[in-house]
Amino acid sequence: GDLLIQKTIKKQVVLEEGTIAFKNWVKTGTEVYRQFWIFDVQNPQEVMMNSSNIQVKQRGPYTYRVRFLAKENVTQDAEDNTVSFLQPNGAIFEPSLSVGTEADNFTVLNLAVAAASHIYQNQFVQMILNSLINKSKSSMFQVRTLRELLWGYRDPFLSLVPYPVTTTVGLFYPYNNTADGVYKVFNGKDNISKVAIIDTYKGKRNLSYWESHCDMINGTDAASFPPFVEKSQVLQFFSSDICRSIYAVFESDVNLKGIPVYRFVLPSKAFASPVENPDNYCFCTEKIISKNCTSYGVLDISKCKEGRPVYISLPHFLYASPDVSEPIDGLNPNEEEHRTYLDIEPITGFTLQFAKRLQVNLLVKPSEKIQVLKNLKRNYIVPILWLNETGTIGDEKANMFRSQVTGKIN
């Protein structure tokens, strides 16, 4: 009975040619969509002139199909029981699942102006930047299409900068025709309890972005976990989108298309300040914006983004400290819509449904030398967009799963 099932499961979740796991792992059978909501700034002039609160109105969803490409350069290493691969990136716009087109316009923070003023802190260099910003008729805010904002546009200000900067800017630029990795994960042949756990990422066991344990690459990529998942487990996974490892804890039992799954969620504790969660001390990288590491709910990933002041949070600053959202009007965080969850089938460890939600923000600071930032009286962590990446096992796959896995056990 149970031993036979365990044996079968152990055999089928190994990441090697011929197993159920491998087939679905190389190319996901699930349709994955990434929905974007853009924060359209309603009062750009008042903010720039009077340092007013930023009034935002979210517009979306704008939906793309993602993760439809098979893993590339899949290479088994029999010696250390690992398999390495690249995860190619691709996004296809889905008009029928969107409120508008990729040509829709939005008023958003000027990414180049905010980033350059942060990266180049020498006052004379800022004087030069100011001349170039003025010459290019750039400002603190800009109007961009969805396509430009996400996938890239040639920035007029950066085009005037002497060297050695790239003149194309976009929140996800470059994306299409790029790949994430190389990932090297354990295939589970020698030890099934290590299956899918990342051994190295880009050839390293550490990220080089954080101090101490924060820099570790822990767990899997969240697409699957080692089999026989217990409710008491803390599931570790690494997300290159947020440049860190994070964890999920059991929340509830869920029935997904007749399959019993465990819903694991990212707890608010994972986003807490070191005051509340001392383990998070190494995610606090500076003292000013974080108010001496007392702010919470935003993660400074600038070190991972070539110095650009990118901050990651949950949508609408869910689980963030009041000081973070105070300068922004129009946000309405709620757990149901804005938290991240994974629905895991406990026997196989496969993630059969998930919703990954995150928000991309950019820091903008006053600058006495840059005219368009001169009137600001405070720092703003400006929300640009939030995304909801979802995948659910298809009906056909669910039937197969019920008959071959859960049905046999019950």
Epitope: H118, I119, Y120, Q121, N122, Q123, F124, V125, M127, I128, S131, L132, K135, V161, P162, Y163, E286, I288, S302, K303, G307
Partner: antibody, heavy 119, light 112 residues
Framework: QVQLQQPGAELVKPGASVRMSCKAS????????MHWVKQTPGQGLEWIGV????????SYSQKFKGKATLTADKSSRTGYMQLSSLTSEDSAVYYC????????????WGAGTSVTVSS | DVLMTQTPLSLPVSLGDQASISCRSS???????????LEWYQQKTGQSPKLLIY???NRFSGVPDRFSGSGSGTDFTLKISRVEAEDLGVYYC?????????FGGGTKLEIK
Amino acid sequence: QVQLQQPGAELVKPGASVRMSCKASGYTFTNYNMHWVKQTPGQGLEWIGVIYPGNGDTSYSQKFKGKATLTADKSSRTGYMQLSSLTSEDSAVYYCTRSGWDDWFFDVWGAGTSVTVSS
Amino acid sequence: DVLMTQTPLSLPVSLGDQASISCRSSQSIVQRNGITYLEWYQQKTGQSPKLLIYKVSNRFSGVPDRFSGSGSGTDFTLKISRVEAEDLGVYYCFQGSHVPPTFGGGTKLEIK
């Protein structure tokens, strides 16, 4: 190769002004800042100021405001420093040097112009 | 202005020995973006200064690997692992993180 050429020496009278030049070659003149540095046996090396030839932006050390004026001529790829109301305190070697427009280290130096203020 | 204090003023060494020059700034010269513009220049008699090390520890092109820079915050060091005759001269530290940029007073490296 990358060079900054300066005249060797200038002899000037007290109260007068001097305009020294620094001719750049071997690189894109408007992509780099041009700095000027004073060296005296007593005071060591002192930064005077900087000009970005791309648009003429300048910045001066407080100590040299009113004393030094920096200009640049893009067509001749030459930077200039004018020193006014000269006194014996201004007798020194003056170097021009360059840095990237966004950087503050000096990778190329001129040979220096020796200024002597004497009646 | 940021004061850069170099020690020692004069450093007598035997050829082949290691030399170490210290530089201390009166305040932190780490910019908010994490970059530290701390450089080391060498000046030989009758010549203009030459860049050796930039941004604390990066050797400028053509500089022999016996020269190395280290430090953080306010304390920085230039090391010459095996002094050669051509290394004699005056060494200056320099900070470019704050305006105005400032030089240290110099350390004269001479033969014992």
